[in-house]
């Protein structure tokens, strides 16, 4: 209706004596601004005066004057939009209708708001979800239709009178739509919360109790069960009777079915709260529980472990681990189903009782081959002694033992022989599957564990073999002791250290690198002639005639070896010089005469000097002195001198006769 003023505010506000009321309010006047505002308590329209009668709680006029007694009531609005009011404190007799008389320049309006003030703080209201189920989070809400800025309050949650640990979230609303304070508590109820009293307590700012609301929680839960057993320790002997009783301590809603489970499997035809087991057997040992269901689901009791006692059953032996490696540790475990557990054990190795072994486990820290064999045991408990089971086999594995390398040949072995060796061992587990030899060579293995060395070398000193299964065991190396003729025979000059000069003392040594056998003989030879039988050949004063090709021989019982020919070179000054003449010592003048200085020298003559009969050196320095044409006056005695690095030598005089030619004689 366009002729109406438009107001928005809560329809009714609630408070209690001594608290306050905050009234959120908005309006829209028909025209212009608000000029006058009067707050009536229970206004009534007077037709005679055409005005409203009633208690005036607040009045504001054009001049803005407010009577001092109106301080309790405050108009917090404005001239065009806001009409919010506050009454602080609020009294019981403020209950009723508040009338907001609004006047603008041309229009008037009366807006009514209900106020409900109680004598004491009214209780909040707890709101619960329609159903609460154990372990499912729910939100409990506590709602109070009150909120006022001037009067702070708090809502606290209590469970069975004790503040709840869970944190609550409090919110307030002071709007034109609603005024309230709300506390929300999230929690996951357990079955034990069923029937428990939850309180939402309204307190003032100081924590003083004002009012509360209470609910008793209805928590839906699976049946909660207790299992009782006779005998109470659930330990019986075969043939005894056992009774188990299932008690429902709580179920919401009521339970519908009952069943019994053994080791998690349902027992057929057992649907009562009592389980009777008559003349039990050991197979009935196990974990028993009862299961009771309701609409929420099944509930299970704790498990009762029923132990049916019996004497040990035939035992078996478990070996950790077989096969076992020699030197490792091995544990034997005697396994025998028995209740109570066996208290004593007897152990057997290959049928013979093992002394001092009475435990369930036997531990051998270092296994040896003799530990191999069959192990069995007997278990004993208070009800009797079991039987010895079939036992378990311990296989002790070890590398091949006492491995030796054996030479099959007759001794001694000579270089070039074919040698056969075998690899022998004493025992092995598992069996030997291969052999190894060292050093490695391009050798034949004609059969497993046999090595054939064709054309054995002089330097094949030792051979070792290994016999291998999962591991390799090496034999000590065996010496082949190959015999051979002396090797690397050579001539070595011992003295002099420098080149040999004629007249020097000279020693030559016959060297060799090795010989087997060691006993040797030496032979020196020059040009096929035996010179000596010592390792050294000595010259007290060497002469050029001693120069030549020398060899030495070394021999042992296997054979002899010659050195390479060694050339002995003797250095000497020129000697045996003579002058030879060509064509002869008598030459006709005008012809050619050649004089040659012949000598024996080492190193060869490097420089010649020619002399005449007057011992005058001639200006010629080559080995040959050529006179061409020869003259009569050339006649006379000539000699030459040869020089090398060692020294000089001179020839005797040789006479050249130059005779006149027939022409010269004819002229005379």
């Amino acid at each position: 209706d366009s002729s109406k003023w438009v107001f928005e505010h809560p329809e009714t506000l609630y408070a209690w004596e001594g608290a306050c009321v905050w009234i959120p309010c908005t309006y829209r006047a028909l025209d212009g601004d608000l000029e006058s505002f009067i707050l009536f308590h229970n206004p009534e329209y007077n037709k005679n005066t055409s005005k409203f009668d009633g208690t005036r709680l607040y009045e504001s006029t054009k001049d803005g004057k407010v009577p001092s007694e109106q301080k309790r009531v405050q108009f917090l609005g404005d001239k065009n939009k806001n009409c919010t009011l506050s009454i602080h404190p609020v009294h019981l007799n403020d209950s009723g209708q508040l009338g907001l008389r609004m006047e603008s320049k041309t229009e008037k309006w009366m807006e009514r708001i209900h106020l409900n003030v109680s004598e004491r703080p009214f209780p909040p209201h707890i709101q619960l979800p329609p159903e609460i189920q154990e372990s499912q989070e729910v939100t409990l809400t506590c709602l109070l239709n009150f909120s006022c800025y001037g009067y702070p309050i708090q809502l606290q949650w209590l469970l069975e009178g004790v503040p709840m640990r869970q944190a609550a979230v409090t919110s307030t609303s002071l709007t034109i739509k609603s005024v309230f304070t709300r506390s929300e508590l999230k929690f996951s109820p357990q079955w034990s919360h069923h029937g428990k009293i939850v309180t939402c307590q309204l307190q003032d700012a100081d924590g003083k109790f004002l009012s509360n609301d209470t609910v008793q929680l209805n928590v839906k839960h699976t049946p909660k069960l207790e299992i009782k057993v006779t005998p109470s320790d659930a330990i019986v002997r075969e043939g005894d009777s056992v009774t188990m009783t299932c008690e429902v301590s709580s179920s919401n809603p009521e339970y519908t079915t009952v069943s019994w489970l053994k080791d998690g499997t349902s027992l057929k035809k057992q649907n009562t709260f009592t389980l009777n087991l008559r003349e039990v057997t050991k197979d009935q040992s196990g974990k028993y529980c009862c299961q009771v269901s309701n609409d929420v689901g099944p509930g299970r009791s704790e498990e009762v472990f029923l132990q049916v006692q019996y004497a040990p059953e035939p035992s078996t032996v478990q070996i950790l681990h077989s096969p076992a490696v020699e030197g490792s540790q091995v544990e034997f475990l005697c396994m025998s189903l028995a209740n109570p557990l066996p208290t004593n054990y007897t152990w057997y190795h290959n049928g013979k009782e093992m002394q001092g072994r009475t435990e369930e486990k036997v531990h051998i820290p270092k296994i040896l081959p003799w530990h191999a064999g069959t192990y069995s045991c007997v278990a004993e408990n208070i009800l009797g002694t079991g039987q010895r089971g079939p036992g378990a086999e311990l296989d002790v594995q070890y590398p091949p033992k006492k491995v030796t390398t054996v030479i099959q040949n007759p001794m001694p072995i000579r270089e070039g022989d074919t040698v056969t060796l075998s690899c022998n061992y004493n025992s092995s587990n598992p069996s030997v599957t291969r052999y190894e030899w060292k050093p490695h060579g391009a050798w034949e293995e004609p059969s497993l564990g046999v090595l054939k060395i064709q054309n054995v070398g002089w330097d094949n000193t030792t051979i070792a073999c290994a016999a291998c299964n999962s591991w390799c065991s090496w034999a000590s190396p065996v010496a082949l002791n190959v015999q051979y003729a002396p090797r690397d025979v050579r001539v070595r000059k011992i003295k002099p250290l420098s080149e040999i000069h004629s007249g020097n003392s000279v020693s030559l040594q016959c060297d060799f690198s090795s010989s087997h056998p060691k006993e040797v003989q030496f032979f020196w030879e020059k040009n096929g002639r035996l010179l000596g039988k010592e390792s050294q050949l000595n010259f007290d004063s060497i002469s050029p005639e001693d120069a030549g090709s020398y060899s030495c021989w070394v021999n042992n019982s296997i054979g002899q070896t010659a050195s390479k020919a060694w050339t002995l070179e003797v250095l000497y000054a020129p000697r045996r010089l003579r002058v030879s003449m060509s064509p002869g010592d008598q030459v006709m003048e005008g012809k050619s005469a050649t004089l040659t200085c012949e000598s024996d020298a080492n190193p060869p003559v490097s420089h010649y000097t020619w002399f005449d009969w007057n011992n005058q050196s001639l200006p010629y320095h080559s080995q040959k002195l050529r006179l061409e044409p020869v003259k009569v006056q050339h006649s006379g005695a000539y000699w030459c001198q040869g020089t090398n690095s060692v020294g000089k030598g001179r020839s005797p005089l040789s006479t050249l006769t130059v005779y006149y030619s027939p022409e010269t004689i004819g002229r005379r």
Epitope: E160, S192, G195, K196, I197, T214, K224, E226
Partner: antibody, heavy 116, light 112 residues
Framework: QVQLVQSGAEVKKPGASVKVSCKAS????????LHWVRQAPGQGLEWIGY????????EYNQNFKDKATLTADKSTSTAYMELSSLRSEDTAVYYC?????????WGQGTTVTVSS | DIQMTQSPSSLSASVGDRVTMSCKSS????????????LAWYQQKPGKAPKLLIY???TRESGVPSRFSGSGSGTDFTFTISSLQPEDIATYYC????????FGGGTKVEIK
């Protein structure tokens, strides 16, 4: 103060039914469960069951499941227990009771006599 | 349901005597949320409704004489009258209220 006022004594013939009332006052009726307890002559106390007046939810002792029916009327803050197919062994004093956090409130009891 | 076993079923004592009775529950009645035992003791005189004496196993209801006391936790509880008075002649019941309600069979106290 909290009060639970029960209806007067009843004499019934075997096979009949009886409805016992328990009027609550002095507290918010819907806040607490209302329990019923039976005491046969010279015997001990035996819990029958409860009703939650807030939502009319009931829970019974298995022994009374087919004997008692619990109801509540929020408008009058009154709880009722109806016993059906009465037999002589149902002769007893029937109490309504409720728990608060630290106390218990009991009605004065209603004697139900079943006699032919 | 939780079973309550009360003993003895009856006892006779002289005025001024210390009287004790026992109550055992088939399961614990201790509530973990507040660590309280949900066990009460009542006195009932012939023709009267039960009167609460003790709640939470050991807390005396206001107005109850100090000669009445309760103790115990979990499943084993004891009720004691330190000095028996003539007006104490009655039947006493234990009551668990942790889960549903169950009552003990009662102990009848008489004066010699």
């Amino acid at each position: 103060q909290v009060q639970l006022v029960q209806s007067g004594a009843e004499v019934k013939k075997p096979g009949a039914s009886v409805k016992v009332s328990c009027k609550a006052s002095g507290y918010t009726f819907t806040s607490y469960w209302l329990h019923w307890v039976r005491q046969a002559p010279g015997q001990g106390l035996e819990w029958i069951g409860y009703i939650n007046p807030r939502n009319d939810y009931t829970e019974y002792n298995q022994n009374f499941k087919d004997k008692a029916t619990l109801t509540a009327d929020k408008s009058t803050s009154t709880a009722y227990m109806e016993l059906s197919s009465l037999r002589s062994e149902d002769t007893a004093v029937y109490y309504c009771a409720r728990r608060d956090i630290t106390t218990f409130y009991w009605g004065q009891g209603t004697t139900v006599t079943v006699s032919s | 349901d939780i079973q309550m076993t009360q003993s003895p079923s009856s006892l006779s004592a002289s005025v001024g005597d210390r009287v004790t009775m026992s109550c055992k529950s088939s399961q614990s009645v201790l509530y973990s949320a507040n660590h309280k035992n949900y066990l009460a003791w009542y006195q009932q005189k012939p023709g009267k409704a039960p009167k609460l004496l003790i709640y939470w196993a050991s807390t005396r209801e206001s107005g109850v004489p100090s000669r009445f006391s309760g103790s115990g936790s979990g499943t084993d509880f004891t009720f004691t009258i330190s000095s028996l008075q003539p007006e104490d002649i009655a039947t006493y019941y234990c009551h668990q209220y942790l889960s549903s309600w169950t009552f003990g069979g009662g102990t009848k106290v008489e004066i010699k």
